[in-house]
């Protein structure tokens, strides 16, 4: 808590300016009105105010709105956004797509913040959708946004984004999300060559189904196994042994160490041990010579 | 045009302070802040302070704090940078550079001072 | 003291493409404009761009600057004999409220 003193004689700021960089807290408590401030939030981006002189200024709007600051002066926070706790933004209502990109680009190139995070979710929420413009946004700046998405809400993300994405972005992606996002993906890079469509789709493949999985197989690409242990288990039982083996080409040999673990464990429990054998692996668990394989799936949608 | 002249080649002992003095022309004196920026022989550059030559306020990087002191004259639009205590680590150019509003950078230099200290 | 960390030196061929970088914290280039100065031997720092990515007036479009969160880098396309020089980046630290300057990268064509 800055004291309360006095404004020296002189000092009294007339307006928002470069001047202020010379005050120090007291004198920018004492001198600087706070509805001044507030109508020329604006330029407070605009001088390099150290982090004491922020707190200050940021002291001056929390007395003057102490139910939450008004979109106007929101929209012109700037780097004084920092010093916004998450409990004061909840305090804030924020319409504007504009406001929102102001205070995102305050924080562009950073990781999301707990402010940004509780930003966006107000933002959402007062917006009452997710609407395409809003999600334009969310992805271009924080391409990982897509993973605290909810299915439905991912259905209106647009390919376009998807450009944006970066594998580590996808890491905390669940099957439900990426079956909604890989479509899109591969409808993004469609015109993409066999290897370069590889590297972009890569990261997506936990939303492919089997189909997608069998034409892989025939491009030589050498899927890794981490990759192949993020796949869709009912999208990798239909594969056959030879198709994996060329899905996965040298990373094959890998297949042994993950053969305990699903998608892999299954998947052996549904070929021919003689069609694993020939692997070489040693994977055990297949199904052995002579027994018939009846699929009781397709047999109880039948009766 | 813009200008900014400073004050000739010094040499001082050890101990003793120093006054380099920068006159400016072609703006308003009091319309933009003055910095000192120094840079040893070989070294970066150094940023030693401000001045507001309008009312005299100053602002010193917490290296020189105690040992600087920077004034102007507006009746000459002259700044100065004075610093005492000199020690052989001072041997530096000194160099004064306006500041432009709003964009905080140093649009225009002088040409630099530079200052021997050696006992 | 030097608070940004750039390259000692870069070298390039003339007409060859030369990116200086520039790497601070979240008080300078993190929450502040940053630029870049040129010097050439013997002579004082000359502004070559500011706010992140402008240039001022008669610095030649083959110099431009680019931020992103805590780091900044300068990227000179068209190499000339005439730029080599020494460079340096800089910002507005808000942690102290001081001026702070990259070391310095000496440009060297080769």
């Known amino acids: 808590e800055v004291e309360k003193t006095a404004c020296p004689s002189g000092k009294k700021a007339r307006e928002i300016d470069e001047s202020l960089i010379f005050y120090k807290k007291w004198e920018l408590e004492a001198c600087v009105d706070a509805a001044l401030l507030a109508t020329q939030m604006d330029r407070v981006n605009a001088i390099p105010f150290t982090y004491e002189q922020l707190d200050v200024l940021k002291h001056k709007l929390d007395e003057l709105y102490p139910q939450g600051y008004p979109e106007s002066v929101i929209q012109h926070l700037g780097y004084l956004f920092l010093k916004m706790s998450p409990e004061d933004i909840r305090k804030w209502n924020v319409t504007s797509l504009e406001t929102l990109k102001a205070l995102l680009e305050v924080n562009k190139g950073h990781e999301m913040s707990p402010q940004v995070a509780t930003l966006i979710d107000r933002f959402v929420k007062g917006r009452g959708q997710l609407d395409k413009d809003t999600l334009d946004t969310l992805t271009a700046f924080y391409p990982g946004y897509l993973c605290s998405l909810s299915p439905e809400e991912l259905s209106s993300v647009p390919p376009s984004s998807i450009w944006a994405v970066r594998p580590q972005d996808l890491d905390t992606c669940d099957p439900r999300q990426l079956d909604v996002l890989y479509p899109k993906a591969r409808l993004a890079f469609q015109n993409m060559n066999g290897s370069e469509y590889f590297v972009k789709i890569q990261s997506f493949l936990g939303g492919a189904p089997t189909e997608d999985l069998k034409a892989l197989s025939q491009q030589n690409v050498s899927m890794d196994l981490a990759t192949f242990m993020k796949l869709r288990t009912d999208a990798v039982l239909p594969l056959t042994v030879a198709e994996v083996q060329k899905l996965l080409g040298p990373h094959v040999e890998g297949l042994k160490a993950e053969e305990r673990h699903r998608p892999v464990r299954d998947w052996i429990l549904r070929q021919r041990q003689d069609d694993l054998d020939t692997l070489g692996l040693g994977l055990q668990g297949g199904i052995p010579n002579g027994y018939l394989v009846l699929d009781l799936s397709m047999q109880e949608a039948l009766s | 045009q813009v200008q900014l002249v400073q004050s000739g080649a010094e040499v001082k002992k050890p101990g003793a302070s120093v006054k380099v003095s920068c006159k400016a022309s072609?703006?308003?004196?009091?319309?933009?802040?003055i910095n000192w920026v120094r840079q040893a022989p070989g070294q970066g550059l150094e940023w030693m302070g401000i001045i507001n030559p309008h009312g005299g306020d100053t602002k010193y990087a917490q290296k020189f704090q105690g040992r600087v002191t920077m004034t102007r004259d507006t009746s000459i639009s002259t700044a100065y940078m004075e610093l005492s205590s000199l020690r052989s680590e001072d041997t530096a150019v000194y160099y004064c550079?306006?500041?432009?509003?709003?964009?905080?950078?140093?649009?225009?230099w002088g040409q630099g001072t530079l200052v021997t200290v050696s006992s | 003291d030097i608070v940004l960390t750039q390259p000692p030196s870069v070298s390039g061929a003339p007409g060859q493409r030369v990116t200086i970088s520039c790497s601070g914290s979240s008080s300078n280039i993190g929450s502040n404009y940053v630029s870049w100065y040129q010097q050439l031997p013997g002579t004082a720092p000359k502004l070559l761009i500011y706010?992140?990515?402008q240039r001022p007036s008669g610095v030649p479009d083959r110099f431009s600057g680019s931020k992103s969160g805590t780091s900044a880098s300068l990227a000179i396309t068209g190499l000339q004999s005439e730029d080599e020089a020494d460079y340096y980046c800089s910002s507005w630290d808000r942690a102290d409220g001081s001026y702070v300057f990259g070391g310095g990268t000496k440009l060297t064509v080769l």
């Open positions: 550079a306006r500041w432009h509003h709003g964009t905080w950078i140093f649009d225009y």
């Open positions: 706010n992140d990515n």
């Open positions: 072609g703006y308003t004196f009091t319309g933009n802040y």
